[in-house]
């Protein structure tokens, strides 16, 4: 390994010794105390035992303190999101202390090795924040850990070995390797703080997963289901970012969860919503829209404290970029059939039309199959405050899209060749908002017009009976 | 203020070992990487790799792995450049160059280099 | 590793005239809105200084007659009124979050 190290995860220095006995020792763990918003500034270095440096460099006992701590690193250097992130705690929180850990040393080595060093990492934190417990008006309530993939567990680490609790602790994207299944004692949990929130962008169920895939926090969000996130995709990366590889696309998806974050703090006014649900199929079934019983909260900075809940997986939508905020409405259609429609499953758009803005043409993503005769669920998004929804066009796409489609058509029109054609009946559709809790019906505006074929649209607009709210003002007045 | 100061240029022969030194004043020599930059006589700049002048340790360029070797003297602020079995194409100015970690990362303090010479 | 191209490789400016060079990166060298382009000014015998970073930062103590503009993989710098001290060679580098940290082969400028 490229560094060496001892036991105690100290170096030592002997790449240049003046003299024949002389060995230079070094903590392996710096804090820096990062006193300018200028990336360039050199900040000033925070060790055990030295209250110089604190007056020096003014840092403020009474106000938060924030520790950012890296993860495994390849290049041996601070990535560009350390500065982004520092940036914006100082925008948001102009009192704060912000503490970068540097523990690239030991981070900088073989992947296991890094992760066998994470407990040393966490000790050292510890050490330093029983320390600056003996300072007068300093307190660990006002202590965040803020940890991106393997810093997440060393986060874990030094709740768990620190005299007393920490206010919080903000996982973004543990690491999954090596600790995927492992004991609570060994990663990140809900035991480490008062409040432990998890962002998880890059799970995976096949292959290697970066990410942690379980819950480990009191609230555990998975932006875009934890795995494909927008604009990390290979074509979007080829031209957008400085990436060109598949090592690229994990990285854009993996260090989304630090985007994330830093997007809840600076544009405040765009808060982001995550919705609690049991899995990530069933938001997309467009089922966990409720904000009863605490189901939904912000992302990021502003989640709220959910100390009751614990390993509580919640869901969410984003764009592409920042900010990061979309508007999520849930459609309940009841779909009536007139004529069997096979094994088809039909290709559905919705456009919204709102007081403010009017949506895109949004595919009604089916998630198992179109249930006949029943009441359908779907989830769509949009990337603008629509306003209150005034209409509503829904579209089915005449030509079929896989050779699947193409063959039931196929297939379907030999056995009934006489009738191929192939009807929908919805009368009307139901429109909750996620974001306001606002429930609306749509109705067709002809009874008698309500059929839908391919390649045919339908006209909703807001029934006769008006609106259907059950809450009149937002749920998110509180969270913000 | 802060001063990056090179030894002076040298004359070597194919085969023999020559170290170049770098020496920082102005700013703690610990807080910035270090970075090397090679030009030869008439050519642009190529960058070599860098070192960690905390932890002492470097990154090399994929050109320069293998003969070259970067190490420091954190308590004399100075950062070592070694080149092994000196070659013709060895023969460029070499600079130091600082850069923040926790920043962009560009040089923003430059030595005033280091010329090195084959003698055939 | 990034590939930067720049161009002209030379170019000769009349006094108070505009300077335009430009570089070109073989990909993006943009992140979350910043782009971690740089450019450098090197005269005979001298090292390098560094004149803009991040596409478009003047160093503090540059004169504002230097700017850089850009975003993605075209970049460029300008320089405008030229003064006769602005003989130099002009180098772009990219500083993005995985090394190696390249250079553009440069660019001469003469002043007329």
């Known amino acids: 390994s490229p560094v060496p190290f001892g036991p105690e995860g100290r170096l030592e220095d002997k790449l240049h010794k003046p003299k024949a006995t002389q060995t230079e020792v070094k903590p392996s763990v710096r804090f820096n105390l990062r006193t300018s918003k200028d990336p360039e500034h050199e900040g000033c270095y925070l060790s055990v035992g030295h209250s110089q440096p604190l007056e020096d460099c003014s840092f403020n006992m009474t106000a938060k303190t924030f520790f950012i701590i890296h993860g495994w690193t390849m290049s041996g250097i601070f990535e560009n999101w350390l500065h982004k992130l520092v940036s914006a705690l100082h925008t948001r929180e102009k009192d704060a202390n912000v503490v970068v850990v540097d523990w690239l040393p030991l981070a900088h080595q073989l992947y296991t090795d890094a992760v066998n060093n994470t407990r040393v990492v966490g000790h050292s934190i510890a050490r330093m924040l029983d320390w600056l417990q003996e300072k007068d008006d300093f307190s660990l309530g006002n202590v965040h850990l803020i940890g991106y993939s393997l810093g997440a567990h060393v986060a874990g680490y030094a709740g768990n070995f620190v005299k007393g609790t920490v206010g919080r602790i903000t996982g973004l994207d543990p690491a999954g390797p090596m600790f995927e299944g492992a004991d609570i004692h060994k990663r990140l949990s809900p035991d480490d703080a008062d409040f432990v929130d998890v962002l998880h962008t890059y799970t995976r169920s096949f292959g290697l997963s970066i990410g942690i895939q379980m819950p480990v926090g009191h609230i555990d969000i998975y932006p875009n289901g934890g795995d494909f996130q927008p604009g990390c995709g290979l074509n979007d990366v080829l031209g957008s970012i400085a990436y060109g590889t598949i090592t690229e696309v994990v990285k854009c998806e993996h260090e989304r969860a630090v985007h994330l974050f830093v997007d809840s703090l600076v544009n405040q006014d765009k808060p982001s919503f995550a919705f609690q649900c049991t899995d990530s199929n069933r938001f997309k079934k467009g089922i966990c829209l409720s904000c009863r019983k605490n189901r939904c909260n912000n992302i990021g900075y502003n989640a709220k404290k959910m100390r009751k809940k614990r390993n509580s997986k919640m869901y969410l939508k984003t764009r592409a970029g920042m900010p990061f905020k979309v508007y999520h409405y849930q459609l309940k259609v009841h779909m009536f059939s007139y004529n069997n429609s096979g094994d088809t499953q039909p290709t559905l758009y919705i456009t919204l039309y709102g007081s403010n803005a009017d949506s895109q043409n949004l595919p009604l993503e089916i998630v198992e199959k179109i249930e006949l005769n029943a009441t359908n669920t779907f989830l769509v998004y949009t990337e603008e405050d629509l306003g209150d929804l005034l209409k509503m066009r829904l579209t089915w796409e005449g030509v079929a899209h896989s050779w699947y489609n193409l063959w039931n058509e196929f297939r379907n029109y030999l056995s009934q060749p006489s009738n191929p054609s192939r009807e929908l009946y919805i009368r009307r559709i139901r429109v909750k908002s996620g974001e306001t809790q606002r429930k609306v019906t749509f109705c067709t505006q002809d009874p008698t017009k309500s059929s839908i074929s391919p390649g045919q649209e339908l006209w909703f607009h807001k029934c006769q009976d008006g609106w259907k709210m059950k809450n009149k003002t937002s749920p998110f007045v509180n969270l913000a | 203020q802060i001063q990056l100061v090179q030894s002076g240029p040298e004359l070597k022969k194919p085969g023999e070992t020559v170290k170049i030194s770098c020496k920082a004043s102005?700013?703690?020599?610990?807080?910035?990487?270090m970075n090397w930059v090679k030009q030869a006589p008439g050519k642009g700049l190529k960058w070599m790799g860098w070192i960690n002048t905390y932890s002492g340790v470097p990154t090399y360029a994929d050109d320069f792995k293998g003969r070259f070797a970067f190490s420091l003297e954190t308590s004399a602020s100075t950062a070592y450049l070694q080149i092994n079995n000196f070659k013709n194409e060895d023969t460029a100015t070499y600079f130091c160059?600082?850069?923040?970690?926790?920043?962009?990362?560009?040089?923003?303090?430059w030595g005033q280099g280091t010329a090195l010479t084959a003698s055939s | 590793d990034i590939v930067l191209t720049q161009s002209p490789a030379s170019l000769a400016v009349s006094l108070g005239q505009r300077a335009t060079i430009s570089c070109k990166a073989s990909?993006?060298?943009?992140?979350?809105?910043?782009?971690?382009m740089n450019w450098y000014q090197q005269k005979p015998g001298q090292p390098p200084k560094l004149l803009i970073y991040a596409a478009s930062n003047l160093k503090s103590g540059i004169p504002a007659r230097f700017s850089g503009s850009g975003s993605g993989t075209d970049f460029t710098l300008n320089i405008h009124p030229v003064e006769e001290e602005d003989a130099a060679t002009y180098y772009c580098?990219?500083?993005?979050?995985?090394?190696?940290?390249?250079f553009g082969g440069g660019t001469k400028l003469e002043i007329k």
């Open positions: 102005g700013y703690t020599f610990t807080n910035y990487g």
């Open positions: 580098q990219q500083t993005t979050d995985d090394p190696p940290w390249t």
């Open positions: 990909q993006s060298v943009d992140y979350d809105g910043d782009s971690y």
């Open positions: 160059a600082r850069f923040s970690y926790y920043g962009r990362h560009y040089f923003d303090y």
